[in-house]
């Protein structure tokens, strides 16, 4: 009778992460008597995947009933495959021995490759807000994909950006990879409603590329412009002075009126009006009793916006 051969018919198998891998193995004879074991890798450091005789292997099931006396099919299924399962798997026949079974013959091996989807890209912007005309950096990260080939694009409001740097790690062979990209974006006053999008395309994606977004409303600070004007006299000895605070973002704003350098009133922006571009306008007014002043009055509208140093605008009120 011909000597037993261990046949692994598949040189290579490709499986999607999360799916089940079937590793086929048959023996050409029932003799010698002894169990089959599956290993990943060869040599002394090989990893035991399945032992017919003993042990607990929750992810492994056999294709055939190995308890049947005439069974020669030793194929296995490994469930919930991850990129970490990639490698070469060997089906090894042992001969019954005492005290230990002795390795008799190995199959040629089946290389298991795993394809894994990239995680949803996460876009993060700068920690502090920045003002228009400044350049800010956004980062995009996606992890866990295989194979290594991946494309990443940046967009601002649908327009592709070109000023970015991308790295895929690790540089060498690995079971899975990560991508990290940094894009530079120049802010404009109209960017409150703008979005920065990071788009990742990979062979495993059946839909459109995966997208991560960041709203520039979380990044931009548009400082206000101030205008102080004197309204016609409302009543005898009373003058109405208004401070127009225009085109600011975010809303957080505190206004202080000063009369000749002395604090007259402080208020917080509440009933603001929103512009089409997402910025806000607000108006504060001060009623000045002219008869209380002998000399001309210097009225100052001082605005502290979003925790920044105060900006101010003054108006000289003539007392005739």
């Amino acid at each position: 009778e011909e000597e037993l051969q261990v046949i692994q018919p598949d040189k290579s198998v490709l499986v999607a992460a999360g799916e089940t891998a079937t590793l086929r193995c048959t023996a050409t004879s029932l003799i010698p008597v002894g169990p089959i074991q599956w290993f990943r890798g060869a040599g002394p450091g090989r990893e035991l995947i399945y032992n017919q005789k003993e042990g607990h292997f929750p992810r492994v099931t056999t294709v055939s009933d190995l308890t049947k006396r005439n069974n020669m099919d030793f194929s296995i299924r490994i469930g919930n495959i991850t990129p970490a399962d990639a490698g070469t798997y060997y089906c090894v026949k042992f001969r019954k021995g005492s005290p230990d079974d002795v390795e008799f013959k190995s199959g040629a091996g089946t290389e298991l490759s795993v394809r894994a989807k990239p995680s949803a890209p996460v876009v993060s912007g700068p920690a502090a807000r920045a003002t228009p005309q400044h350049t800010v950096s956004f980062t995009c990260e996606s992890h866990g994909f295989s194979p290594r080939d991946i494309t990443l694009k940046w967009f601002k409001n649908g327009n592709e950006l070109s000023d970015f740097q991308t790295n895929v790690d690790p540089v060498g062979e690995s079971v899975s990879y990560s991508i990290h990209s940094t894009a530079k974006v120049v802010l404009t006053r109209e960017d409150v409603h703008s979005q920065v999008i990071c788009e990742v395309a990979h062979v495993t994606l059946q839909g459109d590329p995966l997208r991560g977004t960041a709203n520039l409303s979380e990044t931009i600070r548009v400082p206000p412009t101030l205008e102080v004007t004197q309204q016609p006299v409302r009543a005898e000895n009373q003058v109405n002075v208004t401070c127009q605070v225009r085109k600011f973002y975010p809303q957080r704003l505190q206004l202080t009126w000063l009369e000749n350098g002395n604090v007259s009133r402080t208020e917080t922006a509440s009933t603001v009006t929103e512009n089409k571009d997402g910025t806000y306008n607000w108006m504060s007014w001060l009623l000045v009793n002219v008869s209380a002043h002998r000399d001309d009055v210097k009225l100052t509208c001082q605005v502290e916006h979003d925790g920044q140093p105060a900006v101010s605008k003054s108006h000289d009120l003539k007392v005739s």
Epitope: K11, S12, D149, T204, Q206, G207
Partner: antibody, heavy 116, light 109 residues
Amino acid sequence: VQLVESGGRLVQPGTPLTLSCTVSGFSLSSYVMGWFRQAPGKGLEYIGIISSSGSPYYASWVNGRFTISKTSTTMDLKMNSPTTEDTATYFCARVGPLGVDYFNIWGPGTLVTVSS
Amino acid sequence: DIQMTQSPSSLSASVGDRVTITCRASQSINSYLAWYQQKPGKAPKLLIYSASFLYSGVPSRFSGSGSGTDFTLTISSLQPEDFATYYCQSWHYISRSYTFGQGTKVEIK
């Protein structure tokens, strides 16, 4: 799992024609689908794909000559203004479950003849 | 666009022969290459995907190898049902576009 193309016929140059690919055994919302063609005695040529979410992508030579769309069970290829060079058998195909780099299921094809 | 050059364009062989068809890409496509078999009046049938993986139900006499720009389809022992035209097809992960080789017709000697 099956794909069947329909709508192929003799059409005059410039007359729009829509081909359909009817699928069964799987959901169009889970796979990328593609259109290909083969002129008599020639090789296979890629026309375009439609993603699982419904976005079409075209070969660089298409330049608006074709439009790909889909419903829940059919994928369509509209020939916007056919010329005699568009005479071919048109195939629809589905990409493999492991990735969009290969097509594992093909329809039998439908013949379009463009002639005056 | 990537060009795929298949060779030979046709070959004559006998049953039992070992047949090799090559496909060259004009730029690297890594391992994103598939091989199809097509018989007259029929749709293409997938044989090999990702350069070297045998598609389910395809006889083991078919094998694929290569990566980067050079790829090979081998039929270890030609069978009567293997007389057909074979196409390679690439996918480019940057342009996300597909290109076919011009085909290799395998005829009976």
